[in-house]
């Protein structure tokens, strides 16, 4: 009789362990579902906002052909400007042609007037060559007009309709550039 009771007790305990395990699995599954739901909702939200905001450039950015430009409202040194653009999914302005230079200088005249704006151009410390931040060389017509007398690192900036050079540690406005979103229509 005692053996029978003990067997029943063991069976009940086994059942209880199985139920606890099932409950744990269910809780885990529920948590996983909730997490997936959250990601799904976030994805939907992003998709909807992208569909709703189908403008090729973000707010406060200017479009020209395949590019979007942002003219900063704060001053910073060249390296910080580079980081500020990167945070926004862009890089400091890289001027590829005279047409682009004309658009930029024309836009700046309208927006702010004759201030200094860092672009993604800097001088290589060893060779003294001018290079864009991605390592490419500027076309001959797009080299800074004056060589800075600074012993420190030298970076390029736009002022009025000229490309000039200055110590990278001076404070200036800056211009970021990113690709415009292609219309999916």
């Amino acid at each position: 009789k005692l053996l029978q009771v003990s067997t029943i007790a063991m069976q009940q305990q086994e059942k209880l362990i199985q139920q606890e395990r099932a409950l744990l699995n269910f809780t885990e599954w529920k948590r996983s579902c909730a997490l997936q739901m959250k990601y799904c909702q976030a994805f939907m939200q992003n998709s909807l906002s992208s569909a709703h905001n189908s403008s090729p450039c973000p707010n406060n950015w200017i479009q020209n052909r395949e590019s979007c430009y942002y003219v900063s409202e704060i001053w910073s040194i060249w390296h910080t400007s580079q980081e500020n653009c990167l945070k926004e999914g862009s890089t400091l302005l890289q001027i590829e042609s005279k047409e682009e230079m004309d658009f930029i200088t024309g836009s700046l005249r309208k927006i702010k007037g004759s201030y200094d704006y860092w672009v993604g151009l800097s001088q290589d410390g060893h060779s003294g060559r001018w290079l864009w931040q991605d390592g490419s060389s500027p076309s001959p017509g797009l080299l800074p007009a004056e060589r800075s007398q600074s012993a420190n690192q030298v970076c390029g900036y736009v002022k009025s309709n000229s490309l000039l050079s200055s110590n990278c540690s001076t404070w200036k406005y800056f211009i970021c550039e990113k690709y415009a979103l292609r219309s999916s229509v």
Partner: nanobody, 116 residues
């Protein structure tokens, strides 16, 4: 929340090469950009290289021509190929990610030591 895991650091002789990897817990093409920073003892953290969601690239002047940043969207991983390493490149290298709201996320860092 974006989790980042760096790997590939180590000890290397001057003139040698290393390749750092940064694996992200999210699809990296949904991010604004990803970047590599470094911090040498007693110095400020500085940007080394960055790559935007659309593939634009930027390098610090000190590493341009020696380091190359790249990414593999399928693996959600960003790489930093470091060639011609110099003792001045010795630092802890951090991977950073900026989401669509420009919020920064940081990895734990990986030590790179270049001996002369």
């Amino acid at each position: 929340q974006v989790q980042l895991q760096e790997s590939g650091g180590g000890l290397v002789q001057a003139g040698g090469s290393l390749r750092l990897s940064c694996a992200a817990s999210v699809n990296i093409d949904t991010l604004n950009s990803m970047a590599w920073y470094r911090q040498a003892p007693g110095k400020q953290r500085e940007l080394v290289a960055g790559i935007t969601g659309s593939g634009q690239i930027t390098y610090a002047n000190s590493v341009r021509g020696r380091f190359t940043v790249s990414r593999d969207n399928a693996k959600s991983t960003v790489y930093l190929q470091m060639n011609t390493l110099q003792p001045e490149d010795t630092a802890v290298y951090y991977c950073a990610a900026y989401d669509r709201s420009s919020t920064p996320y940081w990895g734990q860092g990986t030590q790179v030591t270049v001996s002369s």
